[in-house]
């Protein structure tokens, strides 16, 4: 798999989920004692994640192949998808148990209850995605991925309820990207910014990915984007399988769907 912007492509592996995230020392992997791991999390306004918090994050796609300290001196790591090089072919929390030697060096799993969470994996027939903090302005340096996977045969009807992102000619600063696939590599539909509501989008299959990115300066009102599952229908009554092609900043790039 390739790794980019906190997500393993062609999978559902998230770098941060349900308030939980992984930290390592500047000098690299497995350098933190328990006291240091605790300090790392607390310096960022959180605390070491509990086993339950790590498992809750894992259930929505949090996967890290690195053992880290958790609350109460426990060590482990979350595996979403078994692989030959990580997790001994198992899924779940690979649990090393409570360590008697708190001077052992591992990474850290932090939980920050104040973090404005965004993204995740969604299988519900309908859902509304909001920019972090909506209806307040979103913050700088945000990156969120929403992965939608519905039942086989269903399609996804995406509609924009509110939309206000920093406006620039190439949508290079803050933007939403839509992909007609389960990653942000294939099936590029379009990149959107500005304050005009983009047209509705209907997927070609049962999966779709939304990516939201904001840069280091200038924020705006944010967005609400709704999706609804569409059950299989006859070809004659299907919606349009294309992104908006209007000019201007609202859709910087319009790509053709690549069939899944």
């Amino acid at each position: 798999w390739g790794f980019k912007d906190g997500i393993f492509h062609n999978s559902i592996w998230l770098e941060r989920a349900a308030g939980v995230y992984h930290r390592e020392a500047r000098s690299g992997k497995y350098k933190l004692t328990y006291a240091e791991a605790k300090a790392v999390c607390e310096f960022e306004g959180g605390h070491l994640a509990t086993y339950k918090q790590l498992e809750a994050a894992r259930k929505i796609g949090f996967h890290v192949c690195a053992a880290g300290w958790m609350a109460k001196g426990r060590v482990g790591y979350p595996i979403v998808k078994p692989g030959p090089n990580c997790g001994f072919g198992k899924t779940g929390i690979i649990d090393y148990g409570i360590r008697l030697n708190r001077s052992e060096r591992w990474d850290a799993y932090c939980y920050n209850p104040h973090a404005k969470e965004c993204g995740g994996v969604f299988t519900d027939p309908k859902q509304i995605f909001k920019s972090p903090g909506f209806p307040n302005e979103y913050e700088d340096n945000q990156i969120c991925y929403w992965h939608i996977r519905l039942k086989y045969g269903q399609r996804i009807h995406l509609s924009f309820l509110d939309f206000d992102l920093e406006d620039d000619p190439g949508c290079l600063a803050d933007y939403v990207e839509i992909y007609d696939s389960y990653d942000d590599v294939h099936g590029f539909v379009g990149r959107y910014c500005g304050d005009e509501l983009p047209d509705d989008i209907i997927s070609t299959g049962n999966v779709m990915t939304l990516k939201f990115l904001s840069d280091a300066s200038v924020t705006a009102g944010g967005f609400q984007i709704k999706y609804v599952a569409m059950d299989p229908v006859s070809k004659s009554s299907q919606g349009k399988n294309t992104s908006t092609t209007s000019t201007g900043n609202k859709n910087f790039l319009a790509g053709r769907f690549s069939h899944l």
């Epitope: 020392a25 500047r26 004692t33 006291a35 300090a39 310096f43 306004g45 913050e139 340096n141 300066s217």
Partner: antibody, heavy 120, light 106 residues
Framework: QVRLQQSGAELAKPGASVKLSCKAS????????MHWVKQRPGQGLEWIGY????????KNKQNFKDKATLTADKSSSTAYMQLSNLTYEDSAVYSC?????????????WGQGTTLTVSS | ENVLTQSPAIMSASPGEKVTMTCSAS?????MHWYQQKSSTSPKLWIY???KLASGVPGRFSGSGSGNSYSLTISSMEAEDVATYYC?????????FGSGTKLEIK
């Protein structure tokens, strides 16, 4: 190049408040943390606290919890420290210093310092 | 609070002489950092992560140590090294500085 430009010297009376500023340039303000350090004349350095500008999260050393209020304005890339209920012991040079947020922390760039004199 | 004790408080060395100053931590830390401060100027990062020299620091400086005991060494003293050197730990709350070692030239 990275620059932390601090506001000029301040003269204040006991019981008053002052707000010191630290304007950052030459880097992405929200990608780093901003710390504040106190140095009394002829004495050593004392860490006051820090702010994470991207989130606004702050953490002060215990004895500065009621003394120093840290804020940041992302639009102007400026960090602020307000010192309240000033006493003579608050007379010092106050410096801002940035860290990159990776652990363990250190400060790679410092402001030139602001001299605060508390006098009646 | 992790108290950092520097010794000696003041020292002087002749040009070309080897200089070593130490920093003792009341609680073990994985890394120590060092700052150089010359009179009426802000401190400058000098050594970070125990042994890495900051940009522009001459190669005659080195840092070492582990646990509770760290040191800064100048292999051959030069006039421009006259300053106060502070150790600093960025591992535990609150972040703390040592009391400083003032280095003078004979």
């Amino acid at each position: 190049q990275v620059r932390l430009q601090q506001s000029g010297a301040e003269l204040a009376k006991p019981g008053a408040s002052v707000k010191l500023s630290c304007k950052a340039s030459g880097y992405t303000f929200t990608s780093y943390w901003m710390h504040w350090v106190k140095q009394r004349p002829g004495q050593g350095l004392e860490w006051i606290g820090y702010i994470i500008p991207s989130s606004g999260y702050t953490k002060n050393k215990q004895n500065f919890k009621d003394k120093a209020t840290l804020t940041a304005d992302k639009s102007s890339s400026t960090a602020y420290m307000q010192l309240s209920n000033l006493t003579y012991e608050d007379s010092a040079v106050y410096s801002c210093a940035r860290s990159d947020g990776s652990y363990p922390y250190y400060f790679d760039y410092w402001g030139q310092g602001t001299t605060l004199t508390v006098s009646s | 609070e992790n108290v950092l004790t520097q010794s000696p408080a003041i020292m002087s060395a002749s040009p070309g002489e080897k200089v070593t100053m130490t920093c003792s931590a009341s609680s073990s830390v994985s890394y120590m950092h060092w700052y150089q401060q010359k009179s009426s100027t802000s401190p400058k990062l000098w050594i970070y992560d125990t042994s890495k020299l900051a940009s522009g620091v001459p190669g005659r400086f080195s840092g070492s140590g582990s646990g509770n005991s760290y040191s800064l060494t100048i292999s051959s003293m030069e006039a421009e090294d006259v300053a106060t050197y502070y150790c600093f730990q960025g591992s535990g709350y609150p972040l703390t500085f040592g009391s400083g070692t003032k280095l003078e030239i004979k």
